[in-house]
């Protein structure tokens, strides 16, 4: 709960953001989870805590592990975990999955190409943008701000995208790279309030006690490629994680389709032998973008066996 | 545009309870604390105390400890704030306010007039 | 507790030109992390309180840039530089520093 995963480069710059947020928050407290010792303030350290962020300046392999942040604040202390990973330099061109981030969509009218967690960082442009390792030359590509903008992109811009940039800490200087992959949509679009197609709003569905069941959260966000949209379940108003049932899982990533044009998201939430008390539970399906929340709520019903007679 | 909707007001008699909601809407209910207010016009603006949705957690004046219980429900994005063993002391608006990350009381609902009389 | 305090009233002011609002903590809102933990909030007649200063010196989303505030750990002000009519109501001072959390007794804005 309240952990999120980090990676890195060895001999790179690595900042993490702690995974809870105050609200507000008025210090933040970074411990090493396995010995419990607390990280330095002092930026003297190769690795040292600033506010909301831990920094590796630069990451080592050994520093791989679980980091414990305590936001703190005058009403209430929370806790997060930070999963770090530091990796070996790869040395082929080969960015081996692990090491990628999400992939990003563009089209004709909007191929911008963000680098993954820059805002994190102290740097200067420009930004130094290389595809499937090769740096990327010619008057298309403009490195702009912390993304890259292609000009009349095509199918063959798909690929794999490292950005890199120097951040800069009292005046040392620590190179950083990301990778994200790049599809290539051929559509223009438009994005609007999030439309859920499925469920619908406070349905009832029948179920079977000890069967499999599955519901599927579907929403449409506009047309075209969807830079911030999200469909997911909760259970009571918790998240799928955080509720503890093994039984019941969210299909793991989001499906997209393009239903008349449109941009949709699928999420199935998958039930596993279902019980009495799943029925007691309220599923909401929630669907966000940058214009809002939408959500509708589903509730299970016992549905009775069918008995086949010969 | 985030928004606090409040319960209406409320007449109830000395000793008795109520329970005063607060439903937010247009922002993820988890991401805020929801605090409550209370105004008159001898004591001013007073501090009640918080509510974290996200977990439950909860921060009390000391001075309205045993008088208000605060609870949230997740599902409906509803904040609740029970008053019990009500006395005169009691009539006021009551505020409920929702944080940011830079600030406690950075959303208000409407306010419910409470009034407790015989 | 944090007593923060306020006078009932202002200056009469004329709309046009600036007003002061004074605000006394009984201890030093200033943290360790740096941040002077003052807020400025506005009831006008009939409604809610309302944001208007946060961390003693920046502006809220949505409030005009006539208000501003400047203090020192423990003495505080704010200034409206062009009295507008809709300014009108009372100016509440809080502190956020540690629990309870406690606000100003009010100073009310007259215009003239």
């Known amino acids: 709960k309240f952990s999120k995963q980090s990676w890195g480069l060895e001999n790179e710059a690595l900042i993490v953001r702690c995974p809870r947020q105050g609200k507000p928050s008025y210090t933040v407290d970074w411990y090493y989870s396995q010995t419990n010792k607390s990280i330095p303030t002092q930026e003297r350290n190769r690795v040292f805590a600033s506010g909301q962020l831990l920094k590796f300046l630069p990451a080592a392999v050994a520093d791989s592990g679980i980091y414990t942040c305590i936001v703190r604040s005058p009403t209430f202390n929370r806790t997060g975990y930070a999963n770090v990973t530091i990796y070996k330099k790869q040395s082929d061109c080969n960015v081996p999955d692990y090491l990628m981030y999400s992939t990003v969509s563009g089209s004709e009218k909007n191929s911008k190409i963000y680098c993954p967690t820059i805002d994190l960082y102290n740097w200067t442009a420009p930004l130094e943008w290389f595809k499937n390792c090769q740096a990327l030359q010619g008057s298309r590509y403009r490195a702009h701000k912390s993304f890259l903008v292609i000009d009349n992109v095509m199918t063959e811009d798909a690929g794999d995208y490292t950005c890199k940039f120097i951040h800069n800490e009292n005046g040392a200087n620590y190179s950083v790279t990301a990778t994200r992959s790049f599809t290539v949509k051929d559509e223009q679009g438009f994005s609007l309030f999030p439309v859920i197609g499925a469920p619908a709003q406070n349905e009832i569905k029948e179920v079977e006690i000890g069967k499999n069941a599955n519901l599927t959260c579907s929403a449409c966000f506009g047309k075209g490629t969807q830079f911030l949209a999200a469909v997911l379940w909760q259970l009571n108003g918790t998240k799928i994680t955080d509720f503890g049932e093994p039984r019941i899982q969210q299909e793991e990533g989001q499906n997209q389709s393009f239903s008349n044009g449109l941009a949709c998201l699928d999420m199935v939430l998958r039930i596993a032998d279902v019980k009495e008390e799943d029925l007691l539970l309220q599923y909401d399906c929630l669907a966000l973008n940058l214009h809002g929340l939408r959500r509708h709520t589903v509730r299970l019903s016992r549905k009775n066996p069918i008995d086949h007679h010969s | 545009q985030v928004q606090l909707q409040q319960s209406g007001a409320e007449l109830v008699r000395p000793g008795a309870s109520v329970t005063l909601s607060c439903k937010a809407s247009?922002?993820?209910?988890?991401?805020?604390?929801i605090h409550w207010v209370k105004q008159t016009l001898v004591h001013g603006l007073e501090w009640i105390g918080a509510?974290?949705?996200?977990?439950?957690?909860?921060a009390y004046n000391q001075k309205f400890k045993g008088k208000a219980t605060l609870t949230a429900d997740k599902s409906s994005s509803t904040a609740y704030m029970e008053l019990s063993s009500l006395t005169s002391e009691g009539s006021a608006v009551y505020y409920c306010?929702?944080?940011?990350?830079?600030?406690?009381?950075?959303?208000w609902g409407q306010g419910t007039t409470l009034t407790v009389s015989s | 507790d944090i007593v923060m305090t306020q006078a009932a009233f202002s200056n009469p002011v004329t709309l046009g030109t600036s007003a002061s609002i004074s605000c006394r903590s009984s201890?030093?809102?200033?943290?360790?992390?740096?941040?002077?933990?003052l807020y400025w909030y506005l009831q006008k007649p009939g409604q809610s309180p309302q944001l208007l200063i946060y961390?003693?010196?920046n502006l809220a989303s949505g409030v005009p840039d006539r208000f501003s505030s400047s203090g020192s750990g423990t003495d505080f002000t704010l200034r409206i530089s062009r009295v507008e009519a809709e300014d009108v109501g009372v100016y509440y001072c809080?502190?956020?520093?540690?629990?309870?959390?406690?606000f100003g007794s009010g100073t009310k804005l007259e215009i003239k």
């Open positions: 961390q003693m010196s």
């Open positions: 306010s929702g944080s940011t990350t830079d600030c406690y009381f950075a959303y």
């Open positions: 201890k030093s809102l200033l943290h360790s992390n740096g941040i002077i933990y």
């Open positions: 809080a502190q956020n520093l540690e629990l309870p959390f406690t």
């Open positions: 247009d922002y993820i209910f988890t991401d805020s604390e």
């Open positions: 509510i974290d949705p996200e977990t439950g957690d909860t």
